[in-house]
């Protein structure tokens, strides 16, 4: 058993709020069985670590947020993985039961003689985790005894089903936001005919079945679905490609619901074949506007649109964060350990001092070199704030006129706090109203990020648009320069005057062949030629028939 | 069908342009490669248009050769031609809009280099 | 980058044998092949593409096979108008390659 995984940050407070985020990286294979994790993370992990400690900060000096009431937290590490977080929030679990049994006076000593030790506050209500399948796990754990899970980032659409998942709340909006946000862009543009991927597991599955329901709804038409791991590889990649290329000239268009390493796998594999710049890339947020994705591959990867959770950088956040330093950082027991991943350094005479360094840490080391904010920051803030929110109203609705946590609020029921965290209304951390649907989710705000040459072997992700709560917005000019160079994903041009749509057996309705009607007839509908009846003969327009005019033979006239 | 045109004796250092005329292909949805065969040797790649217009060469070429297309023609421009040159040069039809296989042929143009 | 390398250069068969031409690509090509027959003064023709799909119009006597970097070229029950050069091509990148064409194998009916 690997003892990072015990490591836990405290802050002690009235009410205890429970976070795991993904301090290391999930084990590799053939360390899954054991449980150990990988390297420590940055934004994923030590970010949203001090972001917990200092939100809280921030809100316990808040007068006007649960005033006479301190908020602690108990931080654990889920390291990207089911069986890890599980297993930490178990132990969570296990403080609630302890202190459950503490109040009715339950606990003993081994010996039978009653026990003087106070045991940890429980956990009121959990944080995170980042990862919807990790999320989905560790709901079904908590959920059984009444805890409140607010994640940051899981974004899967089965998490709305309040049936199954009814204690798991988001300040971030379900998959099928984005699905329906991709499925605007393509009918924005007249893209009638495009090719699918996915990535294999829950994010890029559910995703890919709303988008393909979605496009259905609307007449677009999907020429093929495929779908490929995260980390499979090169070959797979590679057939995938030519797949995509069997359909081209007509599906230009490739929407991929996919994680970033899987579009970096396309990318990749365009380099090998030979295929940059014949497809355009429509991502999800798995792409976002990451630069891990394109790096090296940028000529690939122009022109892609991808859909980007809506979330500025929080500056309070970066003041607070950057001043950091292992000397006086002593809350965040993880901090050395990153210190000396980030610096490549040892830091001598520390408890935590890595002998794999050679370098010894120098004191002018800062943070604000290379600094990057974690893109989920706004969201891991409201997430800690909707929880603070939400006891902040249950205060004033058990405990009216009282300052404080009043008897009836203690010990505090999950049911009651659930209740009142789905009624939250605040203005997050960036301006913009937090609250949440009867499923437990939040409304859907992205951005539309462009790929682009900004100048010779200069590429840089530009925002071109926006999609609010249904309502897409798009420059057009930004990303086309001009009309004519949209790009066509389409399977059969429009039918001429006096033609009709005959669509091959087996295949889509959007790929058909145009046959004219015959000399007697007119178009009936897109699909249908009828003949006009006898003494009657095809409009112009051929739209309809029209009455031939009675013309009476006389003996004097010429042969016609 | 696919025919090659424009192949004559030439020096060294003169250019020279190949034409490849197409009739019953629509030049937007299939690809179409060059491929050269000098005197007794085997089939040799120069390079493909795709259907949306891009251009792929043989690591070889290094810039001697550009392919460009009409909407009914395919052109392959020789850059400052050498004895090695010499060979009968090849339009064909690719399977689909970008490399694969090249499933219709034209009949082939020669090009002798010589001086 | 994916260099096709074709044995043998030259084959010998007697009407009615069999003949087996091998191909190898520098790395896998994913099935990703052609075979054409080539006769003198004409242009070459199509026989099997993806390893193994016969071209239409191409006897069934010639049979394509392999995966990954083998791949075998198999013509049973040979006929004199059999005679002619056999190129295998791989169909799957145009990117930094050399010769996409094997190096041709030569048959002769007897």
């Known amino acids: 058993q690997s003892s990072e995984r015990r490591v836990v940050a405290h802050m002690p407070g009235d009410i205890i709020i429970g976070a795991l985020f993904s301090v290391h990286h999930q084990p590799t294979v053939d360390k899954v069985h054991e449980r150990k994790c990988g390297a420590v993370r940055e934004q994923y992990g030590i970010q949203r670590v001090e972001a917990m400690l200092h939100t809280l900060e921030r809100i316990n000096s808040d007068p006007t947020l649960l005033p006479n009431i301190t908020l602690g937290c108990e931080i654990r590490d889920s390291c990207w993985h089911s069986a890890v977080a599980l297993e930490q929030s178990i132990e969570f679990i296990r403080d609630s039961l302890i202190s459950s049994e503490e109040e009715e006076g339950l606990v003993r000593c081994v010996d039978g003689s009653s026990s003087s030790f106070r045991s940890k506050k429980p956990i009121v209500g959990v944080i995170g985790p980042g990862s919807s399948s990790v999320a989905i796990q560790v709901q079904n754990l908590l959920q059984l005894f009444n805890i409140p899970q607010i994640a940051y980032s899981a974004t899967s659409m089965d998490l709305s089903d309040k049936t199954l998942f009814k204690y798991f709340m988001r300040v971030v909006p379900s998959d099928a936001q984005q699905a329906r946000a991709m499925v605007d862009i393509v009918k924005r543009y007249n893209w009638t005919y495009v090719s699918a991927v996915h990535t294999e597991g829950n994010y890029g599955e559910s995703g890919m079945e709303a988008f393909k329901d979605m496009s259905a709804k609307e007449g677009i038409c999907i020429a093929h679905s495929y779908k490929i791991y995260s980390n499979a590889g090169e070959q797979s990649f590679d057939k995938l490609l030519k797949k995509l290329t069997s359909h081209l000239p007509k599906a230009r268009v490739v929407a991929c619901f996919c994680e970033g390493m899987t579009v970096r796998g396309l990318l990749m594999a365009m380099r090998r074949l030979g295929l940059a710049g014949e497809f355009l890339l429509l991502g999800s947020d798995g792409w976002a506007d990451r630069y891990d994705v394109t790096d090296g591959y940028q000529r690939e990867a122009v022109g892609g649109i991808t859909i980007k959770l809506q979330s500025p950088d929080v500056k309070w956040f970066d003041d607070y964060y950057l001043k950091l330093r292992p000397e006086t950082n002593h809350r965040n027991p993880w901090f050395q350990e990153f210190w000396q991943h980030r610096f490549q350094c040892r830091l001598e005479g520390f408890p935590q001092e890595n002998s794999k360094y050679n370098k010894t840490c120098n004191s002018s080391l800062t943070l604000k070199t290379h600094h990057v904010q974690d893109s989920k920051m706004g969201f891991v803030i409201n997430a800690i704030y909707s929880m603070a929110y939400g006891l902040h109203n249950m205060q004033m609705s058990l405990c009216p006129g009282y300052a404080g946590l009043c008897d009836a609020m203690k010990p505090i029921d999950g049911r009651k706090l659930l209740e009142s965290l789905m009624k939250t209304n605040f203005t997050g951390v960036s301006g913009d109203t937090i609250l949440f649907d009867e499923n437990g989710d939040s409304p859907g705000r992205y951005e539309i990020m462009n790929f682009k040459e900004m100048g010779k072997d200069y590429f840089d992700y530009i925002n071109v648009g926006s999609w609010d709560n249904g309502e897409l917005k798009m420059d057009d000019d930004e990303v086309w320069s001009k009309k004519s160079n949209i790009i066509r994903s389409v399977c059969s041009e429009p039918c001429e005057k006096g033609q009709i749509k005959v669509i091959r057996k087996g295949e889509v309705s959007c790929c058909w062949t145009c046959t004219p009607c015959k000399e007697n007839e007119y178009v009936f509908d897109e699909y249908t030629c009828k003949a006009c009846q006898l003494g009657s003969w095809p409009t112009d327009d051929l739209t309809g028939c029209d009455l031939i005019p009675v013309q009476y033979l006389r003996w004097g006239d010429p042969e016609p | 069908s696919l025919e090659e045109s424009g192949g004559r004796l030439v020096t060294p250092g003169t250019p020279l342009t190949l034409t490849c005329t197409v009739s019953?292909?629509?030049?937007?949805?299939?690809?179409v490669g060059w491929v050269r065969q000098a005197p007794g040797k085997g089939l040799e790649y120069i390079g493909i248009?795709?259907?949306?217009?891009n251009t792929w060469y043989a690591s070889w070429v290094k810039g001697r050769f550009t392919i460009s297309k009409t909407s009914t023609t395919v052109d392959l421009k020789l850059a400052s031609l050498t004895t090695e040159d010499t060979a009968t040069y090849f339009c064909?039809?690719?399977?689909?809009?970008?490399?694969?296989?090249?499933?219709?042929w034209g009949p082939g143009t020669l090009v002798t280099v010589s001086s | 980058a994916y260099d096709m390398t074709q044995t043998p250069a030259s084959v010998e068969v007697a009407v009615g044998g069999t003949v087996t031409i091998k191909c190898q690509a520098s790395?896998?090509?994913?099935?990703?092949l052609a075979w054409y027959q080539q006769k003198p003064g004409q242009p070459p023709k199509l026989l099997i593409y993806?390893?193994?799909d016969l071209a239409s119009g191409v006897p069934s006597r010639f049979k394509g096979s392999g995966s990954g970097t083998e791949y075998t070229l198999t013509i049973s029950g040979v006929q004199c108008d059999d005679a002619a050069t056999y190129y295998c091509?791989?169909?799957?990148?145009?990117?930094?390659?050399?010769?996409?064409f094997g190096g041709g194998t030569e048959v002769v009916v007897k």
């Open positions: 064909a039809r690719g399977h689909g809009a970008t490399y694969d296989y090249f499933n219709l």
């Open positions: 019953g292909i629509d030049l937007s949805s299939y690809a």
């Open positions: 248009i795709y259907a949306s217009g």
């Open positions: 790395q896998s090509i994913s099935s990703y």
């Open positions: 993806d390893a193994s």
């Open positions: 091509q791989q169909g799957l990148a145009t990117a930094n390659v050399d010769n996409v």
